[in-house]
């Protein structure tokens, strides 16, 4: 009778992460008597995947009933495959021995490759807000994909950006990879409603590329412009002075009126009006009793916006 051969018919198998891998193995004879074991890798450091005789292997099931006396099919299924399962798997026949079974013959091996989807890209912007005309950096990260080939694009409001740097790690062979990209974006006053999008395309994606977004409303600070004007006299000895605070973002704003350098009133922006571009306008007014002043009055509208140093605008009120 011909000597037993261990046949692994598949040189290579490709499986999607999360799916089940079937590793086929048959023996050409029932003799010698002894169990089959599956290993990943060869040599002394090989990893035991399945032992017919003993042990607990929750992810492994056999294709055939190995308890049947005439069974020669030793194929296995490994469930919930991850990129970490990639490698070469060997089906090894042992001969019954005492005290230990002795390795008799190995199959040629089946290389298991795993394809894994990239995680949803996460876009993060700068920690502090920045003002228009400044350049800010956004980062995009996606992890866990295989194979290594991946494309990443940046967009601002649908327009592709070109000023970015991308790295895929690790540089060498690995079971899975990560991508990290940094894009530079120049802010404009109209960017409150703008979005920065990071788009990742990979062979495993059946839909459109995966997208991560960041709203520039979380990044931009548009400082206000101030205008102080004197309204016609409302009543005898009373003058109405208004401070127009225009085109600011975010809303957080505190206004202080000063009369000749002395604090007259402080208020917080509440009933603001929103512009089409997402910025806000607000108006504060001060009623000045002219008869209380002998000399001309210097009225100052001082605005502290979003925790920044105060900006101010003054108006000289003539007392005739």
């Amino acid at each position: 009778e011909e000597e037993l051969q261990v046949i692994q018919p598949d040189k290579s198998v490709l499986v999607a992460a999360g799916e089940t891998a079937t590793l086929r193995c048959t023996a050409t004879s029932l003799i010698p008597v002894g169990p089959i074991q599956w290993f990943r890798g060869a040599g002394p450091g090989r990893e035991l995947i399945y032992n017919q005789k003993e042990g607990h292997f929750p992810r492994v099931t056999t294709v055939s009933d190995l308890t049947k006396r005439n069974n020669m099919d030793f194929s296995i299924r490994i469930g919930n495959i991850t990129p970490a399962d990639a490698g070469t798997y060997y089906c090894v026949k042992f001969r019954k021995g005492s005290p230990d079974d002795v390795e008799f013959k190995s199959g040629a091996g089946t290389e298991l490759s795993v394809r894994a989807k990239p995680s949803a890209p996460v876009v993060s912007g700068p920690a502090a807000r920045a003002t228009p005309q400044h350049t800010v950096s956004f980062t995009c990260e996606s992890h866990g994909f295989s194979p290594r080939d991946i494309t990443l694009k940046w967009f601002k409001n649908g327009n592709e950006l070109s000023d970015f740097q991308t790295n895929v790690d690790p540089v060498g062979e690995s079971v899975s990879y990560s991508i990290h990209s940094t894009a530079k974006v120049v802010l404009t006053r109209e960017d409150v409603h703008s979005q920065v999008i990071c788009e990742v395309a990979h062979v495993t994606l059946q839909g459109d590329p995966l997208r991560g977004t960041a709203n520039l409303s979380e990044t931009i600070r548009v400082p206000p412009t101030l205008e102080v004007t004197q309204q016609p006299v409302r009543a005898e000895n009373q003058v109405n002075v208004t401070c127009q605070v225009r085109k600011f973002y975010p809303q957080r704003l505190q206004l202080t009126w000063l009369e000749n350098g002395n604090v007259s009133r402080t208020e917080t922006a509440s009933t603001v009006t929103e512009n089409k571009d997402g910025t806000y306008n607000w108006m504060s007014w001060l009623l000045v009793n002219v008869s209380a002043h002998r000399d001309d009055v210097k009225l100052t509208c001082q605005v502290e916006h979003d925790g920044q140093p105060a900006v101010s605008k003054s108006h000289d009120l003539k007392v005739s």
Epitope: S113, T151, V203, Q206
Partner: antibody
Framework: VQLVESGGRLVQPGTPLTLSCTVS????????MGWFRQAPGKGLEYIGI?????SPYYASWVNGRFTISKTSTTMDLKMNSPTTEDTATYFC?????????????WGPGTLVTVSS | DIQMTQSPSSLSASVGDRVTITCRAS??????LAWYQQKPGKAPKLLIY???FLYSGVPSRFSGSGSGTDFTLTISSLQPEDFATYYC???????????FGQGTKVEIK
């Protein structure tokens, strides 16, 4: 799992024609689908794909000559203004479950003849 | 666009022969290459995907190898049902576009 193309016929140059690919055994919302063609005695040529979410992508030579769309069970290829060079058998195909780099299921094809 | 050059364009062989068809890409496509078999009046049938993986139900006499720009389809022992035209097809992960080789017709000697 099956794909069947329909709508192929003799059409005059410039007359729009829509081909359909009817699928069964799987959901169009889970796979990328593609259109290909083969002129008599020639090789296979890629026309375009439609993603699982419904976005079409075209070969660089298409330049608006074709439009790909889909419903829940059919994928369509509209020939916007056919010329005699568009005479071919048109195939629809589905990409493999492991990735969009290969097509594992093909329809039998439908013949379009463009002639005056 | 990537060009795929298949060779030979046709070959004559006998049953039992070992047949090799090559496909060259004009730029690297890594391992994103598939091989199809097509018989007259029929749709293409997938044989090999990702350069070297045998598609389910395809006889083991078919094998694929290569990566980067050079790829090979081998039929270890030609069978009567293997007389057909074979196409390679690439996918480019940057342009996300597909290109076919011009085909290799395998005829009976």
């Amino acid at each position: 799992v099956q794909l069947v193309e329909s709508g192929g016929r003799l059409v005059q140059p410039g007359t729009p024609l829509t081909l359909s690919c009817t699928v069964s055994g799987f959901s169009l919302s889970s796979y990328v689908m593609g259109w290909f063609r083969q002129a008599p005695g020639k090789g296979l040529e890629y026309i375009g794909i439609i993603s699982s979410s419904g976005s079409p992508y075209y070969a660089s030579w298409v330049n608006g000559r074709f439009t790909i769309s889909k419903t829940s069970t059919t994928m369509d290829l509209k020939m916007n203004s056919p010329t005699t060079e568009d005479t071919a058998t048109y195939f629809c195909a589905r990409v493999g479950p492991l990735g969009v780099d290969y097509f594992n299921i093909w329809g039998p094809g439908t013949l379009v003849t463009v002639s005056s | 666009d990537i060009q795929m050059t298949q060779s030979p364009s046709s070959l004559s062989a006998s049953v039992g022969d070992r047949v090799t068809i090559t496909c060259r890409a004009s730029q690297s496509i890594n391992s994103y290459l598939a091989w199809y078999q097509q018989k007259p009046g029929k749709a293409p049938k997938l044989l090999i995907y990702s350069a070297s993986f045998l598609y389910s139900g395809v006889p083991s006499r078919f094998s694929g190898s290569g990566s980067g720009t050079d790829f090979t389809l081998t039929i270890s022992s030609l069978q009567p049902e293997d007389f057909a035209t074979y196409y390679c097809q690439s996918w480019h992960y940057i342009s996300r576009s597909y290109t076919f080789g011009q085909g290799t017709k395998v005829e009976i000697k």
